[in-house]
């Protein structure tokens, strides 16, 4: 199905023309332009950048480009009362203080408005007490501490290393454990790759570097004061006490030099095993408190940040579709950064900019896509996906009726090893087919396809000769579109070698050292990986907007549904006695999956054979494809997470970044052996199985012949 069938355009106006127009040199130029000063959400600098992007998108040829503003809760350090952590002696004197800011990188010493490291939305407070080291502060780490080691964190300040899971989950876990404060730090074991120098001589984290980030547990709510509704002029706002997802204890991030000073004196219990030890020259004792001579010393936090309602700005560009203007394909990525945003987000924003320019060139030559393409530069992603969520809340009725697909465009790179894709199963075939047509940028794969290098470097664990595609989790702007609204979504970026590089994110993530030079010197000097990501993201948008039949394959959903049903059944079967006692059966779910598989197969045959020249029939089939993702939405949402409504996928309750399949059943089964009322717990498992069964069956029926 040629894309050129869509709007009777001349053959040169096809995907190839669009892809050929994308230039690495332009992406490089745009990245440089976007990274010279900080663009923190809610600041004048970020408003000015929004206006610049609006102006340039208009110049590129989009039909309209609008700024949409919202007044949302943001969080900033107090400029005159800095945040820090002290070691205090028995007299209350501060004998060591953590740093007040990161040593600025060369060439940026005189840049103003670099926000010092802080944990966004931390409450104010000055807790004082003994320290407990809690490893990564994951659910399993607290289980180990509390259940196995009998260490009580109540009234203690906990120190946790960054990595493995979203920082908001760490804080939530610490709160539930009774901690009075949380210190987050970057251990070299997670953020310093062996054999690589620290920035500015390499891409590793220096000891004074610190990861900023929000510590919310929003569960998809958007602005904490206006859950479910846009934060506009007439919005009703909750009081701070009722705000969604705010932490209740002070939290502050530090680098590994400061962590060294806090951890080197730790006493109490030894670490349980090597998985709790990082690579600082400290014992990694768990505590509580300091050892021997230092046992009278305590740790004190001084947190003075404030949360305030602040105006944010999205940029929304429209390229109207020629045939189906009421069908929207969205390409969106955020613009706000913690500091310079060399990778996050501007490596993504620069790619979006070049994609818009290329589409604009085609439009200037008389071409239009079949469907409408919306381009978005989101604000306040770093503060909880606020810009995208508020816009989607404001436009939810349109989006749920007209939204075909959402392609996310945050950081284009987190490494330079191979491609990484997370998407709905509906897009698997689109991604495979597209990457087979693109050239690999990888050394040693000259003249080979991207599909080939990707498959070689990141093979699928299930299917030989195919690359790995992961589940969508959260922690980025696709969340509201996929998890709340059920719009087919995907994301792609270049990544590291997960086999050899065990660090969590890239080492300089959310630090002052995430600069243009970091990218240009160490990650992608030729901007060839950026160009490849532009081709993947842009190519997906092109196909989704321009192919006559939507490039979705519902059979791939059938395959994963079977895999997920097997997985959750196997988890449940760890409790065979209880399943028998409480009559827990997955038969209905497997039956629904079987029905889905059969109906999807028949639908695919009809899709292959129907008369594509019949516009009514074409629209009907395309609508069935578009609405399939929507059919997995439960309007009631998941238990205690009303804005996570997708029954097949949700962000893990233990790690927002990770996707979990059949999350309702998974959460009902989690740690079920420790529940005080097993009968009620297994009753909830049965309820969740029935919801999943109904949803899969209902989704299958949307693919049946309509009459």
């Amino acid at each position: 199905k040629s894309s050129s069938e869509a709007t009777n355009i001349t053959p040169k106006h096809n995907m190839k023309a669009f892809l050929d127009e994308l230039k690495a040199e332009n992406i490089k130029k745009f990245l440089h332009n976007f990274t010279q000063i900080p663009h923190l959400a809610g600041t004048e600098q970020n408003f000015q950048l929004a206006k610049q992007i609006q102006s340039q998108w208009k110049e590129f040829g989009l039909d309209s480009v609008e700024l949409t503003h919202y007044d949302v809760l943001l969080s900033y350090p107090n400029k005159t009362h800095p945040n820090y952590i002290s070691i205090i002696n028995e007299d209350g004197n501060e004998i060591f203080n953590t740093s007040l800011f990161e040593p600025p990188p060369a060439g940026y010493e005189n840049v103003s408005d670099i926000v010092p490291p802080f944990s966004a939305f931390s409450p104010q407070g000055m807790p004082e007490g003994d320290l407990v080291y809690v490893n990564y502060a994951r659910t399993e780490d607290f289980f180990k501490l509390e259940r196995d080691m009998k260490i009580n964190c109540s009234g203690k300040i906990v120190i946790a290393r960054y990595g493995k899971v979203f920082r908001g989950n760490k804080v939530k876990n610490a709160q539930l454990a009774g901690a009075t404060g949380v210190i987050l730090y970057s251990d070299p074991d997670d953020y310093f790759a062996p054999g690589v120098k620290s920035y500015p001589d390499g891409w590793n984290l220096p000891g004074g570097g610190v990861q900023r980030g929000n510590i919310l547990n929003l569960n998809g709510a958007g602005d904490p004061l206006t859950p479910g509704y846009p934060a506009n002029e007439y919005a009703y706002r909750r009081g701070m006490a009722e705000a969604v997802g705010l932490p209740s204890i002070p939290v502050h991030p530090i680098g590994y030099y400061d962590a060294q000073k806090l951890l080197e004196k730790m006493g109490g219990s030894a670490s349980p095993d090597s998985s709790w030890r990082g690579s600082l020259k400290v014992p990694y004792n768990v505590g509580p408190g300091f050892t021997g001579n230092f046992s009278t010393q305590k740790v004190k936090m001084h947190i003075h940040s404030t949360s305030e309602v602040t105006r944010i700005y999205n940029v929304i560009g429209t390229l109207r579709g020629a045939v189906e203007p009421d069908r929207y394909v969205i390409l969106g990525g955020h613009r706000d950064s913690w500091v310079f945003g060399g990778i996050d987000p501007q490596s993504g924003a620069a790619v979006v900019h070049e994609i818009v320019r290329s589409f604009g060139m085609l439009k200037k030559e008389g071409w239009r896509p079949r469907r409408t393409i919306l381009f978005a530069s989101w604000d306040a992603e770093e503060f909880g996906l606020l810009g995208s969520t508020e816009w989607a809340e404001e436009n939810s009725r349109l989006l749920q009726e007209r939204g075909v697909a959402y392609i996310n465009a945050d950081s284009s790179i987190e490494g330079n090893y191979t491609l990484r894709v997370d998407c709905t199963p509906l897009m698997y075939s689109l991604v495979y087919n597209l990457t087979k047509e693109l050239e690999s940028p990888d050394e040693g794969f000259e003249g080979k396809s991207l599909y080939e290098s990707w498959t070689k470097k990141s093979p699928s664990p299930e299917f030989s000769g195919m690359p790995r595609i992961s589940k969508l989790g959260s922690g980025n702007d696709f969340e509201v579109f996929f998890q709340r609204l059920g719009i087919a979504s995907g994301r792609a970026r270049y990544t590291k070698n997960w086999e050899t590089n065990k660090f969590s994110s890239y080492p300089l993530y959310h630090s002052v050292y995430e600069t243009y030079e970091l990218v240009e010197k160490f990650y992608d000097p030729m901007f060839k990986y950026h160009l490849t990501v532009a081709q993947v993201r842009g190519g997906m948008v092109f196909e989704l907007a321009n192919s006559v039949v939507l490039p979705f394959d519902c059979r791939d959903y059938a395959v994963v549904l079977r895999k997920y049903a097997d997985k959750i059944y196997n988890i449940s079967m760890k409790h065979p006695q209880e399943m028998k006692t409480y009559s827990v059966s997955f038969d209905s779910l497997f039956s629904a999956v079987k029905n889905f598989t059969e109906i999807a197969s028949k639908f695919s045959e009809r899709l292959r054979d129907f008369d594509k020249s019949n516009p009514i029939l074409l629209r009907m089939m395309n609508d069935q494809l578009m609405f399939l993702e929507r059919a997995f939405i439960d309007p009631l949402g998941l238990p205690d997470r009303p804005f996570y409504r997708h029954v097949i996928y949700a962000p893990s309750s233990h790690n927002k970044y990770a996707g979990e399949s059949f999350p309702g059943i998974y959460d009902a089964l989690f740690d079920i052996e420790s529940k005080v009322d097993p009968s009620q717990a297994w009753g909830e498992v049965k309820r969740q199985i029935s919801i999943a069964t109904f949803t899969v069956q209902a989704a299958a029926e949307t693919l049946s012949e309509v009459a």
Epitope: Y84, I95, F96, N97, T98, S99, L100, F101, P103, P104, A106, E109, G207, G208, Y257, D258, Q260, K261, L280, K281, N293
Partner: antibody
Framework: EVQLVESGGGVVQPGRSLRLSCAAS????????MHWVRQAPGKGLEWVAV????????YYADSVKGRFTISRDNSKNTLYLQMNSLRAEDTAVYYC??????????????????WGQGTTVTVSS | QSVLTQPPSVSGAPGQRVTISCTGS?????????VHWYQHLPGTAPKLLIY???NRPSGVPDRFSGSKSGTSASLAITGLQAEDETDYYC???????????FGGGTKLTVLG
């Protein structure tokens, strides 16, 4: 060229004050911890004070605690030592020194890799 | 009385090897704090000779080497030369003083 130049020394009476300055050039001053070290006539080197790059930490030798204050102005690439209640035993050559970068810890917990030529302070009635 | 103890003087003939010891305690060298060595000609700026126990800054000849064991450290100079005749200081951090400590200094004389 990396350089440290001290100034402000002189002859002063006991009990009076003096302010020493150290102008840094040839390196990114704002990213380094800085020390003051002195050498009394006929004696060895004695560490006086240190300040972290961001002034979050300042430490002093017991002999000067409560009388001397170390500070810095990162916008002027200058280190200071404010010396109050001076005593005869404070007579010395005062050196400023840059803290040494060495991987495992804040530089100001390490040695000193670049030194100035020194400025002489004489406390005498 | 310095916290770190060095011999007041050592001497050696040109071409010979000499060592200068630096003895501390469990709150400084013995607490795994690094030892650094300086060369100081009075009236000039001290010069860093060895950092982090055994590392040489660029420009320092490999005739100079450092080592550390337990609560002591030492500086070795091989192939003594006339220009080596000056004062040498060891330095470390002391956790009980929360301060940086120097040895009393060692005067090296090159005989000849």
């Amino acid at each position: 060229e990396v350089q440290l130049v001290e100034s402000g020394g002189g002859v002063v009476q006991p009990g009076r004050s003096l302010r020493l300055s150290c102008a840094a050039s040839g390196f990114t001053f704002i990213t380094y911890g800085m020390h003051w070290v002195r050498q009394a006539p006929g004696k060895g080197l004695e560490w006086v004070a240190v300040v972290s790059f961001d002034e979050s930490n300042k430490y002093y030798a017991d002999s000067v605690k409560g009388r001397f204050t170390i500070s810095r102005d990162n916008s002027k690439n200058t280190l200071y030592l404010q010396m109050n209640s001076l005593r005869a035993e404070d007579t010395a050559v005062y050196y400023c020194a840059r803290a040494l970068r060495d991987g495992n810890n804040w530089d100001y917990f390490n040695g000193m890799d670049v030194w100035g030529q020194g400025t002489t302070v004489t406390v005498s009635s | 009385q310095s916290v770190l103890t060095q011999p007041p003087s050592v001497s050696g003939a040109p071409g010979q090897r000499v060592t200068i010891s630096c003895t501390g305690s469990s709150s400084n060298i013995g607490a795994d704090y690094d030892v650094h060595w300086y060369q100081h000609l009075p009236g000039t700026a001290p010069k860093l000779l060895i950092y982090g126990n055994s590392n040489r800054p660029s420009g320092v000849p490999d005739r100079f080497s450092g080592s550390k064991s337990g609560t002591s450290a030492s500086l070795a100079i091989t192939g003594l030369q006339a220009e080596d005749e000056t004062d040498y200081y060891c330095q470390s951090y002391d956790s009980s003083l929360s301060g940086w400590v120097f040895g009393g200094g060692t005067k090296l004389t090159v005989l000849g």
